[in-house]
């Protein structure tokens, strides 16, 4: 019925409007409403226009696409011509009573399907389903997928390309890991991956100063160290380095009229020359302070050597040996002095004897036929040596003796002229001065080392060398190496050394063959009153702590790996220091300070005495241990 | 008051292994270090094993050494003594004990179990 | 390994009277030195430790002394529950070691 009225509509319009020209109201008449007739009038004088002979050629622009004037007028009630649909975006064009609706295909929108839908923006489909990346197109969308991304057969979702097993050799010798959208080249910590190269080259750290002092780079790594002689340790960073604490301060306060016996390791540290009238004899008195069993007081003799007497101390008693022109003689006798103690000790020569006193009651009284020294020109000239011998006597002593004492004397007065001029020798150089209190034991003041040649060998022992240790140690610093054996090369086979812990207040005992740490005793308080114990034993199988301590260790099979490293030094020469390391690299030891505090060591058995050692620091005391500072009210 | 209470003991031909389990209570089992001591029947205290508070070092006497085996499960405050090739001479109670101090040194004994018998016998 | 020796192995003393323990080291054990009491079918219970310092809950007639390799136990006046074996016991080094023990009984 609605086309029949359309055909109708058309022909009236045929009619009245073409075959002849028709106005407004005549037009009313065809269409029978205003608003069809409102459009369509203005139009139809434009198709006149364009069409009626002689008009301007810009007229017919907007009617272009008609031949003719039936053309242009039949398509004035059509909406839908000229199409106003956007051409891309509409589906179909409905034309109404001076309107049209355009029906839009998926994916546009708009009266005239003139918008494209972004379906990558519908908050209802988030992404557009797209697991990557959602691109927008006009009318429509699709999605791909990153670099190293396949997309799979649903068009939406993207699978990862394992890059590593599609070219194996994509890294070289470095490991290829996949990972997603790409790989990576992956090195051991340590090392950087060569892109040229494809190889993984070790990264050298010590190039990019990461150590504060020293730093020794090796493949794969690095490691700083401190320079422990110059007391300084590495800090808990690993990195930066700083000074090595006292933990215990040690009363080191001296007295200019004390004289320090054990200046020098070898020598004599004081000497004297005695111009007397004939008559004079000999005598010595002086108050005497030492723990060493063994040393000399002092040693006298005639300006030509041929008459000498010796002052000495041998098992911890008073020794005179004496050799003139008349006698040879050696007496030992008397209490053991070697108290720590002050004794006060006289040798005087009487007309016919020497008489040796302590505490002023006589202990000793040897006969002599004739002078001591024998006075030439009516002058008696004598040569007065402490703590040592002017030069090698040794074959011409009654028995040898080593004459190393480490002890004091005060309230001297020789050949009955006292003290005068030597005080002021004395005042003047303070390592000479003796400390004022002191204890038993022996002193390391964290600035030298003491070396011995130890056999370890032990030719009935079917494990071959054996080294059982026993250290009693009272530390005053927390850092520091107590014993180490190193060999001809310059490596440290073996060593014990104390660190300060991270517990706060406390010291690990490190025990290390090389630069590897085997054993840590863990979180002692060391720095302490007491003295504190060690006890260990070592042969080629086995380290094995025998005080019941709590200790960290390496694996077994690393242990014995260790021990065939020291196995090995051991069958070579090593020489064994005690407070610290010789001249040997920061990095053969994991600890290079030297030890600072008192230390007595037991090496298979035997009680090292300093005084027997190689070489001696003269700033190690072998028999005196200053005592713990206690704070007093004023201090 | 520590309660130290041990298990596990009876009779095991000579050859055989046993398991004994001490169970601790009433103090901090982790912190400290301990111990199984054993008495013969008739004889003094010998002292067997030790070990530290985590489990991590051993200790054993030169007549035990390769056969018994110390050791703990701090989760459930447990300390194990595991015996095996038992001979006769091993017959003894065997007390566990706990040591004196923690921290870094192995100590005397402060508690004792009341101990469990181990006989070897045919 | 240390040693530990231990006299009298039985002592006999009237309750109320004195009694003295004797303990000796092989080697040196410095102070590390413990004094255990134990009575008929029970488990040992220690009485001091340092050699002379006396563990919580022990009276004060029980005492110790000495250092190195010589120590001492003495109980100042025995009551009816002292009667027991004593054992004395180093914790110097591994292995820890104790003495055969002394068995205090009533005379």
């Known amino acids: 019925a609605n086309s029949m009225l359309e055909e109708t509509k058309q022909g009236n319009l045929e009619r009245e409007c073409i075959e002849e020209l028709c106005n407004k109201e005549e037009a009313r008449e065809v269409f029978e409403n205003d608003p069809e007739t409102d459009y369509f009038y203005p139009k139809y004088l434009v198709c006149l226009r364009s069409f009626q002979s002689g008009l301007f050629t810009a007229a017919r622009q907007s009617t272009d696409a008609y031949p003719d004037l039936r053309s242009c007028v039949n398509a004035i009630p059509d909406q839908c011509s000229p199409l106003p649909c956007n051409e891309d975006g509409y589906m179909s064009c409905k034309d109404g009573k001076a309107s049209f609706t355009c029906t839009c295909k998926p994916g546009w929108q708009g009266e005239k399907c003139e918008f494209d839908i972004n379906e990558c923006k519908d908050p209802s489909n988030i992404n557009g389903g797209c697991s990557q990346i959602c691109d927008n197109t006009p009318g429509s969308y699709h999605c791909s997928c990153k670099s190293g991304f396949v997309m799979l057969s649903n068009k939406k979702d993207c699978k990862d390309v394992d890059e590593c097993s599609l070219k194996p050799n994509m890294c070289g010798t470095a490991v290829c890991k996949n990972i997603p959208g790409d790989f990576e080249c992956e090195c051991p910590e340590g090392y950087r991956y060569n892109l040229k190269s494809k190889s993984c080259e070790d990264v050298d750290e010590c190039s990019e100063n990461m150590c504060a002092q020293l730093c020794v780079n090796y493949p794969g790594g690095y490691t700083c160290y401190c320079d422990g002689k110059k007391g300084f340790k590495l800090a808990q960073d690993q990195k930066s380095c700083e000074a090595v604490s006292v933990c215990l301060p040690l009363n080191l306060d001296t007295k200019y009229e004390l004289l320090y016996l054990a200046e020098q390791f070898a020598g004599v540290v004081l000497y004297l020359k005695f111009r007397l009238p004939e008559i004079s004899r000999f005598s010595a008195e002086f108050d005497f302070r030492t723990y060493d069993s063994q040393g000399v007081i002092l040693y006298a003799e005639s300006i030509d050597h041929s008459a000498w007497l010796l002052i000495a101390l041998r098992g911890g008693k008073i020794e005179v040996q004496l050799k003139n022109e008349h006698t040879s003689k050696i007496t030992t006798g008397g209490d053991i002095i070697n108290n720590g103690l002050w004794n006060m000790v006289s040798v005087e020569e009487l007309e016919h004897s020497i008489s040796i006193k302590i505490a002023k009651e006589a202990v000793m009284d040897i006969n002599k036929p004739g002078p001591l020294f024998k006075p030439e020109n009516g002058l008696l000239e004598t040569k007065v040596y402490f703590a040592g011998f002017p030069r090698k006597v040794e074959s011409e002593l009654i028995k040898p003796i080593n004459p190393r004492l480490d002890g004091c004397i005060r309230s001297w007065n020789l050949m009955k002229q006292g003290a005068s001029g030597i005080k002021e020798i004395i005042q003047e150089k303070q390592n000479k001065h003796c400390l004022v209190t002191v204890e038993k034991g022996s002193y390391y003041p964290g600035s030298g080392i003491a070396e011995f040649h130890i056999d370890y060998n032990n030719g009935s022992n079917a494990e071959g060398w054996h080294i059982n240790v026993t250290l009693n140690i009272r530390p005053s610093m927390g850092t520091g190496v107590m014993l180490a054996l190193v060999s001809s090369n310059n490596t440290v086979p073996f060593a014990v050394s104390l660190v300060d812990s991270t517990s706060e207040k406390s010291q690990d005992i490190v025990i290390s063959v090389e630069n590897t740490v085997i054993y840590r005793i863990q979180a002692l308080s060391l720095c302490s009153n007491q003295r504190s114990h060690l006890e260990f034993r070592v042969n080629r199988n086995n380290l094995e702590l025998l005080t019941p301590l709590k200790i960290e260790t390496i694996s077994q099979e690393e242990l014995q790996t260790q021990l065939a490293i020291l196995d090995k030094a051991m069958k070579g020469k090593v020489a064994t220091y005690l407070g610290g390391l010789p001249d040997v690299p920061f990095s053969a030891t994991p600890v290079n300070a030297f030890y600072n505090g008192c230390m007595e060591v037991n090496i298979n058995g035997v009680e090292l005495d300093l005084d027997e050692a190689i070489s001696k620091h003269n700033d190690i005391r072998a028999h005196s241990c200053p005592s713990v500072w206690k704070k007093t009210k004023n201090s | 008051e520590v309660q130290l209470l041990e298990s596990g003991g009876g009779l095991v031909q000579p050859g055989g292994s046993l398991r004994l389990s001490c169970a601790a209570s009433?103090?901090?089992?982790?912190?400290?270090?301990m111990s199984w001591v054993r008495q013969a029947p008739g004889k003094g205290l010998e002292w067997v094993s030790a070990i530290s508070d985590s489990g991590s070092n051993t200790y054993y006497a030169d007549s035990v050494k390769g056969l018994f085996t110390i050791s703990r499960d701090n989760s459930k405050n447990t300390l194990y003594l595991q015996m095996n090739s038992l001979r006769a001479e091993d017959t003894a109670v065997y007390y566990c004990?706990?040591?004196?101090?923690?921290?870094?040194?192995?100590?005397?004994?402060?508690?004792w179990g009341q101990g469990t018998l181990v006989t070897v016998s045919t | 390994e240390i040693v530990m020796t231990q006299s009298p192995a039985t002592l006999s003393v009237f309750p109320g009277e004195r009694a003295t323990l004797s303990c000796r080291a092989s080697q040196s054990v410095r102070s590390n030195l413990a004094w255990h009491q134990q009575k008929l079918g029970q488990a040992p219970r220690l009485l001091l430790y340092?050699?002379?310092t006396r563990a919580t809950g022990i009276p004060a007639r029980f005492s110790g002394s000495g250092s190195g390799t010589e120590f001492t136990l003495a109980i100042s006046s025995l009551q009816s529950e002292d009667f027991a074996v004593y054992y004395c016991q180093q914790y110097n080094s591994w292995p820890f070691t104790f003495g055969g023990g002394t068995k205090v009984g009533i005379k």
């Open positions: 009433r103090f901090s089992f982790s912190s400290y270090a």
């Open positions: 004990a706990k040591n004196y101090e923690s921290g870094g040194y192995y100590t005397f004994f402060d508690y």
């Open positions: 340092g050699a002379s």
